[in-house]
Interface confidence: low
């Protein structure tokens, strides 16, 4: 091979020479010289660097602020940031999960299609014919109308998307 004119992966060019980058979890203390390796030091408590780098300072772990409804989902390491999620009943407002809002409830006439998670809101769907929801809820699905026939009853009042059918006794045939 010819003498090098560029550095390879996991190296960086400085003062016309190639130095090894610091591995994830470590920061740069001093560049290499012709006789010495790059000097790196581990990140401190509550700090991280997640790539091969030449950073002189580690990044601070994210703070999951309980005042914003946040809690720690995964504790950070020297190589990874802390991952925040939201308290029960709340979900993140963005992918970065910097704050939380209450889960949406599905109004009467709508049921829960997908229950909310820490990162996604409740997904509601209109109750189709034959189903109803008479409550505002973040958990309840649309319920099927009661089957009067199976109870040997008849429909006295038709159901809607917000109400169940009302069943009653069958009219007796007079002799």
């Amino acid at each position: 091979p010819e003498p090098p004119t560029a550095c390879r992966e996991k190296q960086y060019l400085i003062n016309s020479q190639c130095c090894s980058l610091c591995q994830p979890g470590q920061k740069l203390v001093s560049d290499c010289t012709e006789f010495t390796e790059t000097e790196c030091l581990p990140c401190g408590e509550s700090e991280f660097l997640d790539t091969w780098n030449r950073e002189t300072h580690c990044h601070q772990h994210k703070y999951c602020d309980p005042n914003l409804g946040l809690r720690v989902q995964q504790k950070g390491t020297s190589e990874t940031d802390t991952i925040c999620t939201c308290e029960e009943g709340w979900h993140c407002t963005s992918e970065a999960c910097e704050s939380c809002v209450l889960h949406r409830s599905c109004s009467p006439g709508f049921g829960v299609k997908q229950i909310a998670t820490g990162v996604s809101d409740t997904i509601c769907e209109p109750c189709p014919v034959g189903f109803f929801s008479n409550v505002s809820s973040a958990f309840e699905k649309c319920h099927p109308w009661t089957s009067c026939e199976t109870k040997d009853l008849v429909v006295q009042q038709a159901g809607t998307n917000k109400t169940d059918v009302v069943c009653g006794p069958q009219d007796r045939l007079r002799a």
């Epitope: 010819e2 090894s20 390796e37």
Partner: antibody
Framework: QVQLVQSGAEVKKPGASVKVSCKAS????????MNWVRQAPGQGLEWMGN????????NYNQKFKGRVTMTTDTSTSTAYMELRSLRSDDTAVYYC????????????WGQGTTVTVSS | DIVMTQTPLSLPVTPGEPASISCRSS???????????LHWYLQKPGQSPQLLIY???NRFFGVPDRFSGSGSGTDFTLKISRVEAEDVGVYYC?????????FGGGTKVEIK
């Protein structure tokens, strides 16, 4: 500190193969090419080739092409040189040597491995 | 292949006196980046070779300043300003600009 520690002496019969190892420590193994140089008894130095442990690319001296294979195991920071179809004139001390990045010279050498080929 | 020719083959020296070794290459060792890829190694008795001078004039880590390299293109010189007893051994010049990298035949430095 940089250290290259080679495997022990070998005695082989003509036609056999030998595989010499070189364990590196004290530096980022994948960042530096590893070279192999041999020295026949009472003779000078002869460059056999080198390997880039990061990509696995090799450069062989044409004289040994087809007979030599250089490999690395990055998990153990070890380089290997295998020489096949040994002849009596392959009797030599075999050295591994690191290629300095900026120096483009062989800055650290192993202690050498004596390979004797004799029937 | 680039042929590296060293002279003399043997060099008897007196401690405290200067010494000089010559090396000639069959092709220029100057790269387009202006570096000259000519190096000097010393092999002390019973030891592995060690790097003394790299890229024509640069002393390697820990090498005493009594060693110096010079030259240009195809003619090179290693000088020892005042030889010491520990300097005995075989000195090799080498090139790393064209594959295969090659070494000179060596110059044996011994105390008179």
């Amino acid at each position: 500190q940089v250290q290259l520690v080679q495997s022990g002496a070998e005695v082989k019969k003509p036609g056999a193969s030998v595989k010499v190892s070189c364990k590196a420590s004290g530096y980022t193994f994948t960042g530096y090419n590893m070279n192999w140089v041999r020295q026949a008894p009472g003779q000078g130095l002869e460059w056999m080739g080198n390997i880039d442990p990061y990509y696995g690319n090799t450069n062989y001296n044409q004289k040994f092409k087809g007979r030599v294979t250089m490999t690395t195991d990055t998990s153990t920071s070890t380089a290997y040189m295998e020489l096949r179809s040994l002849r009596s004139d392959d009797t030599a001390v075999y050295y591994c040597a690191r290629l300095g990045l900026q120096l483009y010279a062989l800055d650290y050498w192993g202690q050498g491995t004596t390979v004797t080929v004799s029937s | 292949d680039i042929v590296m020719t060293q002279t003399p083959l043997s060099l008897p020296v007196t401690p405290g006196e200067p010494a000089s070794i010559s090396c000639r290459s069959s092709q220029s060792l100057v790269h387009s980046n202006a570096n000259t890829y000519l190096h000097w190694y010393l092999q002390k008795p019973g030891q592995s070779p060690q790097l003394l001078i790299y890229k024509l004039t640069n002393r390697f880590f820990g090498v005493p300043d009594r060693f110096s390299g010079s030259g240009s293109g195809t003619d090179f010189t290693l000088k020892i300003s005042r030889v010491e007893a520990e300097d005995v051994g075989v000195y090799y010049c080498s090139q790393s600009i064209h594959v295969p990298w090659t070494f000179g035949g060596g110059t044996k430095v011994e105390i008179k």
